[in-house]
């Protein structure tokens, strides 16, 4: 889980070691602050849980791409 050290900066100290189906993911945000020990991606799930993930992992990149496309596609 992400950790807010001094709000509003949120950092990740550990990454999930499991791939998560993209259909469980609702959105993401990138963590690039120099105040954090490592770059990270925080996924928010469909039940509003937050998960720290490693942006270097392929499944993380694929999930971000999928969520980007989902956001761009207007619902009819």
């Amino acid at each position: 889980q992400p950790d807010a050290i001094n709000a509003p900066v949120t950092c990740c100290y550990n990454f999930t070691n499991r791939k998560i189906s993209v259909q469980r993911l609702a959105s993401y945000r990138r963590i690039t602050s120099s105040k954090c020990p490592k770059e990270a991606v925080i996924f928010k799930t469909i039940v509003a849980k937050e998960i720290c993930a490693d942006p270097k992992q392929k499944w993380v990149q694929d999930s971000m791409d999928h969520l980007d496309k989902q956001t761009q596609t207007p619902k009819t």
């Epitope: 999930t16 499991r18 791939k19 998560i20 993209v22 469980r24 039940v47």
Partner: antibody, heavy 120, light 113 residues
Framework: QVQLVQSGAEVKKPGASVKVSCKVS????????MHWVRQAPGKGLEWMGG????????INAQKFQGRVTMTEDTSTDTGYMELSSLRSEDTAVYYC?????????????WGQGTLVTVSS | DIVMTQSPDFLAVSLGERPTINCKSS????????????LVWYQQKPGQPPKLLLY???TRESGVPDRFSGSGSGTDFTLTISSLQAEDVAVYYC?????????FGQGTKVEIK
Amino acid sequence: QVQLVQSGAEVKKPGASVKVSCKVSGYTLTELSMHWVRQAPGKGLEWMGGFDPEDGETINAQKFQGRVTMTEDTSTDTGYMELSSLRSEDTAVYYCATDPGGYSGYFDHWGQGTLVTVSS
Amino acid sequence: DIVMTQSPDFLAVSLGERPTINCKSSQSVFYSSNNKNYLVWYQQKPGQPPKLLLYWASTRESGVPDRFSGSGSGTDFTLTISSLQAEDVAVYYCQQYYSSPWTFGQGTKVEIK
């Protein structure tokens, strides 16, 4: 193709513990999330718990809290489910199950089942 | 926890007929952002583990005959077998995977009349 092979049937006395194993082949354990589901004789399916990346840990159904321990040995790709303080109502077939190659919440591969009989 | 309720508990149907099994969830398992229902159906034959039939309420798992179909959204779902075959005798379970703990319906036993 994922394959799950479980340990053999067990007969236990009330109050004892049982540990069931589930060996994964075709994938590594860290590519999957292993869960445990039980089925009492003539009854329905009951999810006991499993690894939940949304919580970053193994989670258990409320009714098993404090009695069940689920562990993983990633060096051998084997999952374990230990149930303690056994009672006659724990007599059931215990299944391990995994999701379709990414934590999903449903199960496309199942072990063959392990019958645990609790009897004095 | 989301409670899943199936009806009926038992169904006796003639070969070639069209059984339908209902599954109701105590709260919606539909997620509007991706337009998906987080519900699966399993088939379990005696002495065997469950077999995944349908996911996302209506998507057939690979290798599942097209006589099996699923419909519904939100809280009310249906599994239909368009023409019952002898090998379809089994217990059928729905399960929600919207939020943990994952919960199953109590099962519907389908037999031949």
